[in-house]
Every structure is written in structure tokens, then in C-alpha cells.
Interface confidence: medium
């Protein structure tokens, strides 16, 4: 999906609101410093694009994340504020559900929510340099 | 698969008030991000507002102040409590679970006086 037309003020403002603090309340317990940031985007696009894959891709040690209130909020805020979005991923959602799996949180998971928060935290600031 | 049934809507006068029922079967509210959106005649669908499972919400600028969406989880039951209701209001009401292709057939809602 090409996240190009989103509108990317109105994904901010969800962020800002809710989404940021369910990706606060995963951490909870966890140090800010305990992960390194290694996954970088480089305008709102490819953040939205990484924070689509990190979001909903399962990964090696982290399988659960997709039906985590952070997750839900996200795929909704991208479907409302990202045209087309939600018909790419009906096919892909209906597949989940009857797969669902159960909520587990891994080290993994942490350090790949880690990532995420970072993601955001850039998706915010469009206008930064690339360190 | 999740079923969604809309109820509530109705005529009704400038500034006044209604409330919007979304009856869910087949799955539970706890597990999902229930939203509302509206279509007016002609115009395309428009995201009203949503409410997490943890009773977190969100609503789009237009309705912010007037509208209040709330769950009731063990009835699987969400809400969308209408005031100060506008002409510009008017439009047929549709919940959805997560936006993902589970939509109610949509209850209509007309602001006439």
C-alpha cells in the first residue's frame, strides 16, 4: 500500500490522543533505555510503511502484536485517514481472525514496541534531518 | 463472522438530540475497535468517531463536542449519543468493527425542521 494521500495530520492527532499511550502502557515496567532504536524511517510514507510492517508482520519471537489495543487503533486510524487502505486489508484481516492468536508478551515484542514508539516519534517530526 | 445492527435513528429538529444503538453478534466488543462513520446523500462515507475496548475515543472535528460514543460490553452494544444536531447532521449512520470489511446496514438520520 502507498501511503502517500494519507492524511497525515489526522493519523498524528490519533497518535497523540490514544495510540501513544497504549504504546506506553505496553512498556510499562520496561526502561527507555533498555532497547537500541535500529529501524529508521525517512518521511511519513515510510514511516507509516515500517510502522504498517512492524504493526502487523509477524516477526521471529514476536507473533502477537496484531490484536494489541495499539495495533487495532493504528489499523483503524489508517483506514479512516488512509483512502483505499482498509479494502487492501479486508482479505489479509478476515485471514487473522480465524487464526487469532492468543496475547503474549515476548522480550521480543518489547524491543519490537520499542521500535514502534521510535517510528512514531519520528512520523511526528517530518521536518527533523535524518541523524 | 461479526453481525452489526443499527438502531436509533429518526427525525429530528435542529439542536436536538438522538441515540444510536450497534448491536453486535458473532463476536465480542472487548476484542475490537468499534467506530461509526455516515454517508449523506451523495457525498462519500465519513469517519464520525471510535471508541476502543479500553473505553479510549476518538472523533473527527466535525462532531467533537456534540457527539459522545460509549460501549456497554456486556450487553455488546455500542452507542453514539447525538446532540446539538445540525441539517448538515443528516445521513445514514453504519458501525464497524476495526474496519475490516464487518459492517451494520446503517440506520438513517434526518435534521429538519
Known amino acids: 500500500y502507498d501511503f502517500t494521500n494519507c492524511d497525515f495530520e489526522k493519523i498524528k492527532a490519533a497518535y497523540l490522543s490514544t495510540i501513544s499511550k497504549d504504546l506506553i502502557t505496553y512498556m510499562s515496567g520496561t526502561k527507555s533505555t533498555e532497547f537500541n532504536n535500529t529501524v529508521s524511517c525517512s518521511n511519513r510514507p515510510h514511516c507509516l510503511t515500517e510502522i504498517q510492517s512492524l504493526t502487523f508482520n509477524p516477526t521471529a519471537g514476536c507473533a502477537s502484536l496484531a490484536k494489541e489495543m495499539f495495533a487495532m487503533k493504528t489499523k483503524a486510524a489508517l483506514a479512516i485517514w488512509c483512502p483505499g487502505y482498509s479494502e487492501t486489508q479486508i482479505n489479509a484481516t478476515q485471514a487473522m481472525k480465524k487464526r487469532r492468536k492468543r496475547k503474549v508478551t515476548t522480550n521480543k515484542c518489547l524491543e519490537q514496541v520499542s521500535q514502534l514508539q521510535g517510528l512514531w516519534r519520528r512520523f511526528n517530526r517530518p521536518l527533523l534531518k535524518q541523524q | 463472522e461479526v453481525q452489526l445492527v443499527e438502531s436509533g435513528g429518526g427525525l429530528v429538529q435542529p439542536g436536538g438530540s438522538l441515540r444510536l444503538s450497534c448491536a453486535a453478534s458473532?463476536?465480542?466488543?472487548?476484542?475490537?475497535?468499534m467506530g461509526w462513520f455516515r454517508q449523506a446523500p451523495g457525498k462519500e462515507r465519513e469517519f464520525v468517531g471510535f471508541?476502543?475496548?479500553?473505553?479510549?475515543?476518538l472523533y473527527a472535528d466535525s462532531v467533537k463536542g456534540r457527539f459522545t460514543i460509549s460501549a456497554d460490553n456486556s450487553k455488546n452494544t455500542a452507542y453514539l449519543q447525538m446532540n446539538s444536531l445540525k441539517p448538515e447532521d443528516t445521513a445514514v449512520y453504519y458501525c464497524t468493527t476495526e474496519w475490516d470489511g464487518y459492517w451494520g446496514q446503517g440506520t438513517l438520520v434526518t435534521v429538519s425542521s
Open positions: 458473532g463476536g465480542t466488543l472487548d476484542d475490537y475497535v
Open positions: 471508541i476502543g475496548s479500553d473505553g479510549s475515543t
